[in-house]
Amino acid sequence: APVPPGEDSKDVAAPHRQPLTSSERIDKQIRYILDGISALRKETCNKSNMCESSKEALAENNLNLPKMAEKDGCFQSGFNEETCLVKIITGLLEFEVYLEYLQNRFESSEEQARAVQMSTKVLIQFLQKKAKNLDAITTPDPTTNASLLTKLQAQNQWLQDMTTHLILRSFKEFLQSSLRALRQM
């Protein structure tokens, strides 16, 4: 399911409950995706020893995964709501090709990988409604994405395992950074 179910069974029993605000819906959506990533990382870590690799060893990869930096305005110091929102949406759009790559990488968690991908699409839609400055958001080039996907899928098994681990780790970090920032807005 691309949208998270109710938080608990009380949702069914409480028809008069206030509908979620836009911010609450986004918050809940990110937490839902993070739970999905956690499940996918469990499978990856059980399958290989990639999770023990240090960040420095992993840094030698040629992936250009989105990452938050001070200049993006999402941290406590130098916080800037508009700049940050643009970075979050742009980053999520850039992650989409990597989430597509993950689709055939899981055996027992195939549905979970699909749910993470679809939920991210929904999250982007939620965030685009919130953003005022949509012109500042650059959409990745489909041709570039297609050739990147082909290149990633042509890697040997070890590199594919490493790539999977790196994508999950980076996506988790990016979503956490985003959630921290969104809770200031």
Partner: antibody, heavy 121, light 110 residues
Amino acid sequence: EVQLVESGGGLVKPGGSLRLSCTVSGIDLSSYDLSWVRQAPGKGLEWVGYIYTDSSTWYANWAKGRFTISRDNSKNTLYLQLNSLRAEDTAVYYCARGSTDYAFDTRLDLWGQGTLVTVSS
Amino acid sequence: DIQLTQSPSFLSASVGDRVTITCRASQSISNELSWYQQKPGKAPKLLIYRASTRTSGVPSRFSGSGSGTEFTLTISSLQPEDFATYYCQQGYNSNDVDNVFGGGTKVEIK
């Protein structure tokens, strides 16, 4: 065995500065979120700040501008720079390793033994 | 600015007693709350996170519950080693806060 060891505490005069270190062994520090927490004699736990794997730092209101958290993953060390110290900053300062599921829900599952900072003239 | 209020501050109990400590948040924090135990002269120890998940190695007599603004830590049958101070910690927001910890509850021998 994973260990966190704080150092750098001691006696300092009001207005003075100090840099605390927390050396971590047995794990790759870069994979974890980290925190400093202090405890004045006979008082409760007081959060100083977090440093996350994305390198962002988040501080308690009272610590902003005076205290700075940094990390050197290559040295497996966490730091806390204390400036413009006051008598009320006298406390045991703990470093702690955290795991975060969402945003700030950083559960501190491993702590150092603490280092005492005394601010007195 | 989220604030946590723990009650009671002090609690006298006997071995075998059922003990309940409450932590109230000034605004909703979902289930993003942890509980710690601290003994004199020692560093705190994580007991429970996500309001109700026990850390490995923590005895089953410790349980956590709650969501939103009201949380409880329950010790079903107090043991001699449980006499300590307990703290709650909110994890919903760390921006514009003075402390993420509650004031603590000291559990003493009656």
